[in-house]
């Protein structure tokens, strides 16, 4: 007998993602509207980029990168299309109401959906800690729940710590790892015997994974610079954000055979570890003053991507249950806390240059946006998988875990497995 | 040479709009973000909106935030303020303001409007 | 909220004259300083509390940091008689100035 979805999920799932859905254009409907002032359709195609590269970077280079599991890639893909889609929405609400729903209605832009997407996109770097083991019902919470705690969190860093758009969403690096990490070890853990090969990786998936994670390569960039108010702090995110991923991605080989005793190159090390210079220089890639730097910290990224992808999984699969291919949250809590360091140390420059106590402050309010960052994203992560353990939404069984079969429909399988 | 030239300016009656235009010439336009500040009669200067050099961001003051929307056309190197429901405490000289942007240290930027046009008079009478 | 002191001052040609703006939380040193004379545009004479503006003379220079500002014009020229005005550029969006001050002959 051919794997079928749970039918209690089969009623739950489209009730509950349609009637969000509906949700969504009611409030759409009541409560937004186009900015219909654009006078240059030139600069609206140059601005439209922009968001392009970041939806590219959301739906092919995350919803591949996560695809690399054996019998999980399908669900990997479509799952990560299914919450970029549903988070975009949600987020282009949520920014409206925090920021200018006081003055009436939600005036929608192309740089509100830039953000939104940039925001969505946390959730596909937390949800690759827990693909595999929760259902589409489960995913819609957990996208509500996060985008919702990352638009405060922005929020009240912006009124707190007044910090500009940039800055304040630099933070996801940090934040999504940390919420990932969080639900993940909320979730059931153990694996059931038999069932350890499909968290294993396969040839073709591991390609697509590539392909996915050479998405995200090129367009980092867009990412790191995408909210930056001048073209001269656009122009030094672009340039030092390339030059720390090529670093990083020389570094991601050559360090990965040299951690392989018989000198061999990990897949999984080089999938995460080409885009850790990106994660490292976004906090401060406007800043940086020169290449140099900005290649030393893709090599420094590099090479503690590669470490951790060698030493941290073991820990990782046995406290929170995240297999070894899903490295991307540990990955970024690391590579993101490099960040927010390498921003704190510029700080702390300036307060040697200044020698004066109040950029001595400044840096004090950093490690308090960071800590806020952590704080918040752990507890809206323990919420979350609080909420997706409840019995409600039909949860796969642990022997299902990372297959696709359980939610796709394969007409060439005439039996299930 | 570097120079902003506002245009639109006029007399208007309570509730009705009124849109200012700002002209640019001698520099790329489309490299810097443009304000507008505006100064009523005897009094000191009010920042009144801000949009990003490629148009994609725009900030307001309070005080003009529903009724004001700004907008640019870099093909035409023009900054526009549209007034609509205009107030009598609108009435103001209205300029133009080119922002330009420096870096502070190692882990900050300054923004300061190095360019102003000479500015156009709005008043609302009824 | 920026606040200027003194509202207005009489001063004579050659005095050395000083200005303060008081910002109500720290805004580090994103402090700009404004002249602007009667019937004319305001022109920029300081830039991140103490850089001097290209073309402005060096009589004129700024100090400060955090929430205490200074516009010091070493000699009074007849040319300085006019208003001048802060510009904190820290908390965007919100651009606020001082509500200026008003330099006048003695």
């Known amino acids: 007998m051919s794997s079928k979805y749970p039918r209690s999920v089969r009623r739950c799932l489209p009730l509950w993602a349609l009637t969000l859905e509906a949700a969504l254009i009611l409030l759409f409907y009541f409560f937004t509207h186009y900015d219909a002032s654009l006078e240059d359709q030139k600069g609206l195609v140059a601005s439209y980029q922009v968001g392009q590269d970041l939806t590219v970077m959301a739906a092919i280079g995350l919803g591949f990168l996560t695809s690399s599991f054996r019998r999980h890639s399908w669900s990997s893909v479509a799952f990560n299309l299914f919450m970029l889609a549903l988070g975009v929405q949600w987020a282009i609400l949520l920014d409206g109401f925090l920021s200018q729903f006081p003055s009436g209605k939600v005036v929608i832009t192309l740089f509100s959906i830039r953000l939104a997407t940039m925001s969505a996109l946390s959730v596909l770097i937390s949800v690759d800690a827990v693909l595999g083991k929760v259902n589409l019902a489960q995913l819609v919470v957990m996208v509500l729940v996060e985008v919702t705690a990352l638009g405060n969190l922005r929020m009240v860093i912006s009124n707190i710590f007044n910090t500009d758009y940039h800055m304040n969403m630099m933070h996801i690096y940090v934040f999504a790892a940390y919420f990932g990490l969080s639900v993940a070890w909320c979730l059931p853990k153990p694996l059931p015997e038999g069932t350890e090969d499909k968290d294993q990786t396969a040839t073709i998936p591991s390609l697509s994974a590539m392909l996915g994670a050479l998405f995200l390569w090129m367009f980092w960039p867009s990412f790191n610079s995408a909210l930056l108010r001048s073209p001269i702090e656009r122009k030094n995110a672009v340039f030092n954000t390339y030059y720390a991923v090529a670093v990083s991605v020389v570094t991601a080989i050559s360090g990965s055979s040299l951690a392989h005793p018989q000198g061999k190159i990990s897949k999984t090390y080089v999938h995460s570890a080409v885009l850790a210079g990106g994660v490292a220089v976004g906090t401060s890639c406007h800043l940086i003053p020169s290449p140099w730097l900005a290649m030393v910290l893709g090599l420094v990224a590099g090479l503690i991507s590669v470490g951790g992808a060698k030493y941290l999984p073991g820990c990782c699969n046995r406290v929170l249950g995240i297999p070894h291919s899903s490295i991307m949250g540990y990955n970024f809590s690391l590579l993101g806390l490099l960040g927010e360091i390498i921003y704190i140390v510029l700080l702390v420059l300036d307060t040697v240059g200044a020698g004066n106590g109040m950029i001595g402050f400044q840096v004090l309010l950093s490690i308090g946006e960071l800590s806020l960052a952590i704080v918040i994203a752990l507890m809206s992560g323990l919420l979350t998988g609080l909420l997706l353990n409840l019995k409600i939404w039909k949860a796969p069984h642990e022997a299902k875990y990372f297959d696709d079969q359980v939610f796709w429909k394969f007409p060439h399988l005439a039996v299930g497995f | 040479q570097v120079k902003l030239l506002e245009s639109g300016g006029g007399v208007v009656q309570p509730g009705k709009s009124l849109r200012l235009s700002c002209a640019a010439s001698?520099?790329?336009?489309?490299?810097?973000?443009m304000h507008w500040v505006r100064q009523a009669p005897g009094k000191g200067l009010e920042w009144v909106a801000f949009?990003?050099?490629?148009?994609?961001?725009?900030y307001y003051a309070d005080s003009v935030k529903g009724r004001f929307t700004i907008t640019r056309d870099n093909s035409k190197n023009t900054l526009y303020l549209q007034m609509n429901s205009l107030r009598a405490e609108d009435t103001a000289v209205y300029y133009c303001?080119?922002?330009?942007?420096?870096?502070?240290?190692?882990?900050?930027?300054?923004?300061?409007?190095?360019?102003w046009g000479k500015g156009t008079t709005v008043t609302i009478s009824s | 909220v920026m606040t200027q002191s003194p509202s207005s001052l009489s001063a004579s040609v050659g005095d050395r004259v000083t200005i303060t703006c008081r910002a109500s939380?720290?805004?580090?040193?994103?402090l700009n300083w404004y002249q602007q004379k009667p019937g004319k545009a305001p022109k920029l004479l300081i830039y991140?509390?103490?850089s001097l503006q290209g073309g402005v003379p060096s009589r004129f220079s700024g100090s400060g940091s955090g929430t205490d500002f200074t516009l010091t014009i070493s000699s009074l020229q007849p040319e300085d008689f006019a208003t001048y005005y802060c510009q904190q550029s820290y908390r965007a969006p919100q651009w606020t100035f001082g509500q200026g001050t008003k330099v006048e002959i003695k």
């Open positions: 303001a080119r922002e330009t942007s420096v870096r502070l240290g190692y882990s900050r930027y300054n923004y300061y409007m190095d360019v």
């Open positions: 991140a509390a103490s």
């Open positions: 001698g520099f790329s336009f489309n490299s810097h973000g």
């Open positions: 949009i990003w050099f490629d148009g994609s961001n725009k």
């Open positions: 939380q720290s805004i580090r040193s994103h």
